[in-house]
């Protein structure tokens, strides 16, 4: 049957948790991603910035996590308005601050 | 200003039972969940076990299930411990602690009793 | 259930950056929490949610965690500093809390 929420959400955590601490050289090379306002629709928004960061498989695996979070297909160049279009960061650090938020999301009961 | 006083500790003899209560004053009680958290002599923290703001819910640490109950009466603001069956083990400093309540009771303990002393011998 | 791995005792002169370690299998998968306790009084809380620091908390307390390891930092260290430490998490799949054994900070 699906997985249930909690548990995908859980699953998604603990695979960043696994890449960023896998990573001895800069995670995808240090490509730079749109950061994203860390709010309703965050998913699709993570999804986007993510998906424009090309042959990087520490994050194929995200990739497709994202999109199970996500009610839209997502595909490169396509960016919503949760983006903020004026700063650029490193996937290391996007990887970082989206699994504090995800953490805390957990904690609250929002699994969707 | 925002407080936690613990009560109820003392001497008391093996198989026997105690009640600790906690007075909370200076923020609403009934949005916090609350825990009981001891110390045994010159050991770490252990925690005891966690009620919900509203009372729905009770969590315990494996080594006092069974033999202690929390609960609270938000029209007094008021915690206690109902400790039952008690073992030299049970020795401890006793804390009252809060914590937002979550979803999941994720939150950090930001406000901490003195803590009462219970001791269990014979 | 969960365990937590702390170091029983760190040692630091004053002034130099202590570094306190709490380790767990996936722990940056979990919010952190770090206590501080001085002996005869009841502990406070020093970091939250992996690095927050409550306002009343001097700017030396640091906080991070990745894959096996939390980590609290305390820079410029002074003699107050001097006092047990505790790490502490949820564990989600027993609904319990788990602290670390503490470690022991002696400022020489």
């Known amino acids: 049957g699906p997985v249930p929420p909690s548990t995908a959400l859980r699953e998604l955590i603990e695979e960043l948790v696994n890449i960023t601490q896998n990573q001895k050289a800069p995670l995808c090379n240090g490509s730079m991603v749109w950061s994203i306002n860390l709010t309703a629709g965050m998913y699709c928004a993570a999804l986007e910035s993510l998906i424009n960061v090309s042959g990087c498989s520490a994050i194929e695996k995200t990739q497709r996590m994202l999109s199970g979070f996500c009610p839209h297909k997502v595909s490169a160049g396509q960016f919503s308005s949760l983006h903020v279009r004026d700063t650029k960061i490193e996937v290391a650090q996007f990887v970082k601050d989206l699994l504090l938020h995800l953490k805390k999301l957990f904690r609250e009961g929002q699994f969707n | 200003q925002m407080q936690l006083v613990e009560s109820g500790g003392g001497v008391v003899q093996p198989g026997r039972s105690l009640t600790l209560s906690c007075a909370a004053s200076?923020?609403?009680?009934?949005?916090?969940?609350m825990h009981w958290v001891r110390q045994a002599p010159g050991k770490g923290l252990e925690w005891l076990g966690v009620?919900?703001?509203?009372?729905?819910?009770?969590h315990y640490a494996d080594s006092v299930k069974g033999r202690f109950t929390i609960t609270r009466d938000n029209s007094k603001n008021t915690l206690n411990l109902q400790m039952n069956s008690l073992r030299a083990e049970d020795t401890a400093v006793y804390y009252c602690?809060?914590?937002?309540?979550?979803?999941?009771?994720?939150?950090?303990?930001?406000?901490w009793g003195q803590g009462t002393m219970v001791t269990v011998s014979s | 259930s969960y365990i937590l791995t702390q170091p029983p005792s760190v040692s630091v002169a004053p002034g130099q950056t202590a570094t306190i370690t709490c380790g767990g299998n996936?722990?940056?998968?979990?919010?952190v929490h770090w206590y501080q306790q001085k002996p005869g009084q009841a502990p406070v809380l020093v970091i939250y949610?992996?690095?927050d620091r409550p306002s009343r908390i001097p700017e030396r307390f640091s906080g991070s965690n990745s894959g096996n390891t939390a980590t609290l930092t305390i820079s410029d260290v002074e003699e107050g500093d001097e006092a047990d430490y505790y790490c502490?998490?949820?564990?989600?799949?027993?609904?319990?809390?788990?602290f670390g054994g503490g470690t022991k900070l002696t400022v020489l």
């Open positions: 200076g923020f609403e009680f009934r949005t916090y969940g």
């Open positions: 502490q998490v949820w564990d989600y799949s027993s609904n319990t809390y788990v």
């Open positions: 602690v809060r914590a937002p309540q979550w979803y999941l009771t994720a939150e950090a303990f930001d406000l």
């Open positions: 009620i919900w703001y509203d009372g729905s819910n009770t």
């Open positions: 996936l722990i940056g998968a979990r919010l």
């Open positions: 949610d992996d690095s």
